[in-house]
């Protein structure tokens, strides 16, 4: 038997993936555990094997279908269970009635690219990945720029309160190496959270023009 407190958290990427993390304080030996998803009105169910990510937490991804298929909608409720093997039987360790569109975490934005760069400014664009058509334009973004000698944690956050897949960074220093990241969040959902940060995009501003001799 497993004692101790348990935490079971899952997020829907808005298309065809539910990612789950299960934390358990009590000692689990070499027990095999899985997450089982049982929608309330769909003719499918899905299972994934929980794999350790730390001493006391396990994670897995429920792949519900093709990456861009809309497998769940706002009307769905999915019963999610953590099941662990106990001898020949499976024991329910955690259970939740999961409302996918109340627990959203999108995929990180992709295809970051420099559209135009000057000495003091840089225009960058990106794309969102595997985001549901249900959001229409109801998305927001956060961006941050890594300056030389600073850490990501120190970088000020720039907020875009609308679906705008580009940004013009101003007041940059000429001939300087920067990195840029962006993340996305739907406006919908009580427990919705930010996507992971995108892969950093490195860029360099142009050198200042040399002054003319008099």
């Amino acid at each position: 038997a497993v004692n101790g407190t348990s935490q079971f958290t899952c997020f829907y990427n808005s298309r065809a993936n539910i990612s789950c993390v299960w934390s358990q304080d009590g000692a689990l030996q070499d027990t095999s555990c899985q997450v089982h998803a049982w929608p309330d009105r769909r003719r499918w169910n899905q299972t994934c094997e929980l794999l350790p990510v730390s001493q006391a937490s396990w994670a897995c991804n429920l792949i519900l279908g093709a990456p861009d298929s809309q497998k769940l909608t706002t009307v769905d409720i999915v019963t999610l269970r953590v099941l662990c093997r106990e001898g020949v039987r499976w024991r329910v360790m955690a259970i939740q009635d999961f409302k996918p569109f109340e627990n959203l975490r999108l995929m990180a934005p992709i295809s970051l690219q420099v559209v135009h760069v000057e000495t003091h400014r840089c225009n960058i664009s990106w794309e969102i990945s595997q985001a549901s058509h249900y959001f229409e334009r109801h998305l927001e973004f956060e961006a941050r720029t890594l300056s030389p000698g600073h850490t990501w944690e120190e970088a000020p956050l720039l907020t875009l309160k609308q679906k705008q897949e580009w940004i013009c960074l101003e007041t940059l220093t000429p001939d300087t190496q920067y990195e840029f990241q962006v993340r996305v969040k739907p406006l919908q959902g009580e427990f919705t959270t930010w996507s992971p940060w995108s892969q950093p995009l490195a860029f360099r501003t142009k050198p200042a023009a040399l002054g003319k001799d008099t």
């Epitope: 009105r41 003719r43 298929s69 809309q70 909608t73 706002t74 009307v75 058509h133 249900y134």
Partner: antibody
Framework: QVQLVQSGAEVKKPGASVKVSCKAS????????IQWVRQAPGQGLEWMGE????????NHNEKFQGRVTMTRDTSTSTVYMELSSLRSEDTAVYYC?????????WGQGTTVTVSS | DIQMTQSPSSLSASVGDRVTITCKAS??????VAWYQQKPGKAPKSLIY???YRYSGVPSRFSGSGSGTDFTLTISSLQPEDFATYFC?????????FGQGTKLEIK
């Protein structure tokens, strides 16, 4: 096998209420949403609302909000739909249907006639 | 509300014909579309769910396709028992809605 059996035809006066029952068998009653759909004579299908017998959760079509009440009795695996303040345009066949994939099994229908 | 516009509203065909009925949703509904067959005085019968999946017991001559806003029900070779009214239905978001129906008659 899955069956949904509905109560018999009703004739009601305008302003009255009607309560239609739908008895389910052949599957785990608590597990699947039961929908209510109506069809006026010679017309199409109109969704009224749904109830999940296990939890009692309900979703209505806003068109019927305040006039429709859905309940369930888990001991008899029966769902009820009550429509109040009846008017002549409520004359229709009322169906219950299970939602699994889509509306997979349907009751035989209950004819409700509203006439003074 | 999402409107489901079915066409044609009526259709005359002969046994053995290939018949196509279309349904257009006013908003993207993914693949959350079903098709039903209804004969006079009877309850609707489920044919297709998730746009293209046939319920067990439904003859293979019935097929569904489409995603997003445009959907099709095809009957590859009409049989005498197929003459009926057909409805499309979206269950992607509340309130669930139906097409107005296509009446398939014998030519």
């Amino acid at each position: 096998q899955v069956q949904l059996v509905q109560s018999g035809a009703e004739v009601k006066k305008p302003g009255a209420s009607v309560k239609v029952s739908c008895k389910a068998s052949g599957y785990t009653f608590s597990r699947y949403w039961i929908q209510w759909v109506r069809q006026a004579p010679g017309q199409g299908l109109e969704w009224m609302g749904e109830i999940l017998p296990g939890s009692g959760s309900i979703n209505h079509n806003e068109k019927f909000q305040g006039r429709v009440t859905m309940t369930r009795d888990t001991s008899t695996s029966t769902v009820y739909m009550e429509l109040s303040s009846l008017r002549s345009e409520d004359t229709a066949v009322y169906y219950c249907t299970r939602h699994y994939g889509s509306f997979d099994y349907w009751g035989q229908g209950t004819t409700v006639t509203v006439s003074s | 509300d999402i409107q489901m516009t079915q066409s044609p509203s009526s259709l005359s065909a002969s046994v053995g014909d290939r018949v196509t009925i279309t349904c257009k949703a006013s908003q993207n509904v993914g693949t959350d579309v079903a098709w039903y067959q209804q004969k006079p005085g009877k309850a609707p019968k489920s044919l297709i769910y998730s746009a293209s999946y046939r319920y067990s017991g439904v003859p293979s001559r019935f097929s569904g396709s489409g995603s997003g806003t445009d959907f099709t029900l095809t009957i590859s070779s009409l049989q005498p028992e197929d003459f009926a009214t057909y409805f499309c239905h979206q269950y992607s978001s509340y309130p669930f809605t139906f097409g107005q129906g296509t009446k398939l008659e014998i030519k």
